[in-house]
Amino acid sequence: MKALSPVRGCYEAVCCLSERSLAIARGRGKSPSTEEPLSLLDDMNHCYSRLRELVPGVPRGTQLSQVEILQRVIDYILDLQVVLAEPAPGPPDGPHLPIQTAELTPELVISKDKRSFCH
């Protein structure tokens, strides 16, 4: 399960991005004097940084553009979907159930006739 631990963080980072994008889109047409879009852009950059950290296989010092980060995220999501689509391992059987009829079957009854050889 540890291998999938980044998923929650990744999900939050993606939500973070989408919320910020939505806020910027809604903010268009407002007075350019408001400082909100600038702080939102800072937040988006923070979200991209979080995403870059969460996607496996990206060396720490690597510089990636926002498009490259998103592409890596998409690839990672697709990989996770493939893993989740595979059937999960299952048990060999259910718990042992006793037979309710307690009759001894003829072939398992101990023979009283102990001959020294069998025909």
Epitope: E86, P92, P95
Partner: antibody, heavy 111, light 111 residues
Framework: QSVEESGGRLVTPGTPLTLTCTAS????????IHWVRQAPGKGLEWIGY??????ARYATWAKGRFTISKTSSTTVNLKMTSLTTEDTATYFC???????WGPGTLVTVSL | AVLTQTPSPVSAAVGGTVSISCQSS????????LSWFQQKPGQPPKLLIY???KLESGVPSRFKGSGSGTQFTLTISDVQCDDAATYYC????????????FGGGTEVVVK
Amino acid sequence: QSVEESGGRLVTPGTPLTLTCTASGFSLSNVYIHWVRQAPGKGLEWIGYISDGDTARYATWAKGRFTISKTSSTTVNLKMTSLTTEDTATYFCARQGFNIWGPGTLVTVSL
Amino acid sequence: AVLTQTPSPVSAAVGGTVSISCQSSQSVWNNNWLSWFQQKPGQPPKLLIYETSKLESGVPSRFKGSGSGTQFTLTISDVQCDDAATYYCLGGYWTTSDNNVFGGGTEVVVK
């Protein structure tokens, strides 16, 4: 408590065939049912099961050609396709725990 | 997984003891998910032992199962004429397929 297989007959290669396992004295809804086969003079071969939650699992060799499904609270089907002469065998169903087996039904695949 | 049993036939004298081994290529589920069956010609298999060492209801205590992981043994003591049969082991595995695998069978001949 017992199970009984039915539907076995002589078929030609390529003919699909469905076998039925019918339970008496208990319900199949909350138990696993296994299908096992035995070619004449050969050993036992596990085909697959359907679980209490209706999940079917198969032996690797049976995947794709064999389908196990619950059709009612007392019957489970084994659907077989693309039959070959190698599939000639007595087919058994067994209840969870493998302590209740049917007498078997003979499937003969021949030209 | 592959289950390898003691080659057939195995001879036993009335009143004697006979042991049949069953080796799995990988550990069975829970290290104990192994059953033993007795089968006579024209009959379905009969469960003797489940979960390595548990005796099925109605089975004489002369039948004893032991082992763990990949190596298992069925021991029949005070052998009777009626014990002449083919014995199969069945391993259970927690996997996506091949959840149950039978051994090739061991014929026991009683003299």
